[in-house]
C-alpha cells in the first residue's frame, strides 16, 4: 500500500525547491526499481517528484489566499514490467498560513449620524475590518480595534469594532468629527500587520438653546395716525439651534396700556410689533413694553435648557400728527 | 457704569443763548434705545425737563420751552449738547443731562449738575 | 400735560419710623410709568423706584413703591439718618413730568 503522512507547505516561501515530504510504496525496497509519478493540477509546475524516491517538492512560491489546497494524483510503476505497483492514489497538499495580509475594512467609507448631547455609552457605529489570513491559523486573522483619533468624545470595544460616546458633545461647538480607527492582526502581538479607517461622526441638533434677544432694549416710533393693526417694527432674538430647533414664538409679556402685540414671521423668525389700539399722543406719547421669546417645539426631556424665556423692553414714542 | 458730565459757561447774559455740553463715560452714545435728556432746577424748587434726543439726532423737547431749545449729539465725540435761546433770569437753575433707564423713561444715571446764572 | 401733586409738601418724622410719602396725578397713568428719585442738598436727584415697584439698582429694600390709576405711594419701612432729604414722583407715559416734591425732615 501507499505510505504518507499529511502534506503541507507554507505559502510564500523563497526557496527554489522546498521539500514537502515523501510518497512511497511499502513495496519499494530501495533499489531503484520503482518509479513515481505525479499527475493533477500542479504537477510539474508547481509540484514536482524525485521518480526513484518519491520525495515530493515545491517549486513555486505559494500563496494561500490565492489556492489553499492542490488535490494531486500519484502512480507508482515497477520499471521492469511498466506496471502499476499500487492503484492511483489522490492526495492532498494543503498550504498552510504565513501572516502576509493586513487587515482591511472593506465599508468604507464610514459615516454616522448621532444626537448632540447624547450620553457616555451610547453607540456610534460599528466598523469591521476582514483579514484574507486564515482565521483557524493562531491569531494571523485575530483582530483588536483600536482608537488612533478621537479622544476623548470617542471609544472602540477593542475585539468587536462598536464605536460609543464617551464624553457630551455640544453641536454648537463642533458639529462634526474625525475618528480613526485601526485594526491589527495578531491580537496586537510583535509581527501584526494593521490597517486603519476614517469614521465621519455628525452630531444631529437637539433644542438645547433657548432663543436670546440680540438687544436687551430696543426703540420703535409710531405716528398717532397710525391705524390698528400697523406693524411699528421689528424685533429679533437668536438661537444657536438649527431648523425646527431654532423656531420661536415671541409675545408680549407686559403692556399695562394693552395697545401693543407682537406676532411672529415663522419665515424670518422675527417678531413684528403691531399696533393694536389707535395712540393719542396728547393722552400717551411714551410707552414700555416687555416682550419675550420662546421656542415652538421642547421637547419635556429639554425644558431644562428653556427655564427662563429671554426678554427685551421695547421703548415706543409716538410721534405727534398736526390736527386740523 | 455710565458717567454723564455737564461743562460750560456758568454765566450767560439775558437775550443769549445758552450752551452746555454734555459727556458720555463708560458706555456709548449710540447704544440702542436709550435717550439723552436735559432736566434743569431752579433754585429751591422742583425738577423741569427739558428734551431728549436719540443718537440718530431724533429730538423731542419739553412744549413750554420748544420754541427756545435745540440738543444735538455728536456720537464721534459722545457727547450731546443743550442750546437754549432768548433766556431770562427765569432760566437761571441747576442743569442737569441724564440718561433713561433699560426697563423705561425714568432717569437711570445722572450728572452732578452745573448751574447756569443768567444775569448782565 | 400730567400734573404731579406731592402731599405732604414736610414730613416731619423721627428716626426708626415710617414714611408714606403720596403722589398724586391730574388724570390717569399706567402705573408702569412712574418713579420716586430722592435729591440730597447740593446733589443730582438719585433713581429710587420705578414701574412704580421696582427698587432700582442699589436701593435698600426699606424703599418700597405702589398705587395705580392717579393714586401712588413711597414708603420708607424704617427711616435710617440719611433718608432724611427730599423725595420727588415723576410720570414718563404722557411727556416727562416731575411732582414739587416732598421734604422729609427730623422730627
Known amino acids: 500500500g501507499w505510505v504518507w503522512n499529511q502534506f503541507f507547505v507554507p505559502e510564500e516561501m523563497n526557496t527554489t525547491s522546498h521539500h514537502i515530504g515523501q510518497l512511497r510504496s511499502d513495496l519499494d525496497n530501495g533499489n531503484n526499481s520503482f518509479q513515481y509519478k505525479l499527475l493533477g493540477a500542479g504537477a510539474g509546475s508547481t509540484f514536482i517528484i524525485d521518480e526513484r524516491t518519491g520525495d515530493i517538492y515545491a517549486i513555486q512560491k505559494l500563496d494561500r489566499e490565492e489556492r489553499s489546497l492542490y488535490i494531486l494524483r500519484a502512480q507508482v510503476i515497477d520499471i521492469a514490467t511498466g506496471r502499476a505497483v499500487e492503484p492511483e492514489s489522490e492526495f492532498v497538499i494543503k498550504v498552510s498560513d504565513i501572516n502576509d495580509n493586513e487587515p482591511k475594512f472593506l465599508d468604507e467609507p464610514y459615516e454616522a449620524i448621532v444626537p448632540e448631547m447624547s450620553p457616555e455609552g451610547t453607540l456610534v457605529i460599528q466598523v469591521t475590518a476582514s483579514d484574507a489570513d486564515d482565521p483557524s491559523s493562531g491569531n494571523n486573522a485575530r483582530l483588536l480595534y483600536s482608537l488612533l483619533q478621537g479622544q476623548p468624545y470617542f471609544s472602540v470595544e477593542p475585539t468587536t469594532g462598536v464605536i460609543r460616546i464617551s464624553s457630551k458633545m455640544d453641536r454648537e461647538l463642533q458639529d462634526e468629527y474625525w475618528v480613526i480607527i485601526q485594526a491589527k492582526d495578531m491580537i496586537g502581538q510583535p509581527g501584526a500587520l494593521s490597517g486603519t479607517t476614517s469614521v465621519l461622526i455628525k452630531l444631529s441638533d437637539v433644542n438645547d438653546n433657548k432663543p436670546i434677544f440680540k438687544e436687551s432694549l430696543y426703540r420703535l416710533t409710531v405716528s398717532e395716525s397710525a391705524p390698528t393693526g400697523t406693524s411699528i417694527g421689528t424685533i429679533m432674538a437668536y438661537d444657536n439651534d438649527i431648523g425646527e430647533n431654532a423656531e420661536m414664538d415671541y409675545s408680549i409679556e407686559e403692556d399695562d396700556s394693552q395697545t401693543f402685540d407682537i406676532i411672529t414671521n415663522h419665515e424670518t423668525q422675527e417678531g413684528i410689533v403691531i399696533l393694536k389700539k389707535k395712540v393719542d399722543f396728547e393722552h400717551q406719547n411714551h410707552y414700555g413694553i416687555r416682550a419675550k421669546v420662546k421656542n415652538h417645539h421642547v421637547p419635556e426631556q429639554l425644558m431644562k435648557y428653556h427655564t427662563e424665556a429671554s426678554t427685551t423692553f421695547i421703548k415706543i414714542q409716538v410721534e405727534d400728527v398736526d390736527e386740523p | 457704569q455710565v458717567q454723564l458730565q455737564e461743562s460750560g459757561p456758568g454765566l450767560v447774559k439775558p437775550s443769549q443763548t445758552l450752551s452746555l455740553t454734555c459727556t458720555v463715560s463708560?458706555?456709548?452714545?449710540?447704544?440702542?434705545?436709550?435717550?439723552w435728556s436735559w432736566i434743569r432746577q431752579h433754585p429751591g424748587k422742583g425738577l423741569e425737563w427739558i428734551g431728549y434726543?436719540?443718537?440718530?439726532?431724533?429730538?423731542y423737547y419739553n412744549p413750554s420751552l420748544k420754541s427756545r431749545v435745540t440738543i444735538s449729539v455728536d456720537t464721534s465725540k459722545n457727547q450731546f449738547s443743550l442750546k437754549l435761546s432768548s433766556v431770562t433770569a427765569a432760566d437761571t437753575a441747576v442743569y442737569y443731562c441724564?440718561?433713561?433707564?433699560?426697563?423705561?423713561?425714568?432717569?437711570?444715571?445722572w450728572g452732578q449738575g452745573t448751574l447756569v446764572t443768567v444775569s448782565s | 400735560e400730567i400734573v404731579l401733586t406731592q402731599s405732604p409738601g414736610t414730613l416731619s418724622l423721627s428716626p426708626g419710623e415710617r414714611a408714606t410719602l403720596s403722589c398724586r396725578a391730574s388724570?390717569?397713568?399706567?402705573?408702569?410709568?412712574l418713579a420716586w428719585y430722592q435729591q440730597k442738598p447740593g446733589q443730582a436727584p438719585r433713581l429710587l423706584i420705578y414701574?412704580?415697584?421696582s427698587r432700582a439698582t442699589g436701593i435698600p429694600d426699606r424703599f418700597s413703591g405702589s398705587g395705580s390709576g392717579t393714586d401712588f405711594t413711597l414708603t420708607i419701612s424704617r427711616l435710617e439718618p440719611e433718608d432724611f432729604t427730599v423725595y420727588y414722583c415723576?410720570?414718563?407715559?404722557?411727556?416727562?413730568?416731575f411732582g414739587p416734591g416732598t421734604k422729609v425732615d427730623i422730627k
Open positions: 415723576q410720570q414718563y407715559g404722557s411727556s416727562f413730568t
Open positions: 463708560g458706555g456709548s452714545i449710540s447704544s440702542s434705545g436709550y435717550y
Open positions: 414701574g412704580p415697584s
Open positions: 388724570r390717569q397713568i399706567s402705573s408702569s410709568y
Open positions: 434726543i436719540y443718537y440718530t439726532g431724533s429730538a
Open positions: 441724564a440718561r433713561d433707564g433699560s426697563s423705561g423713561w425714568y432717569f437711570q444715571y
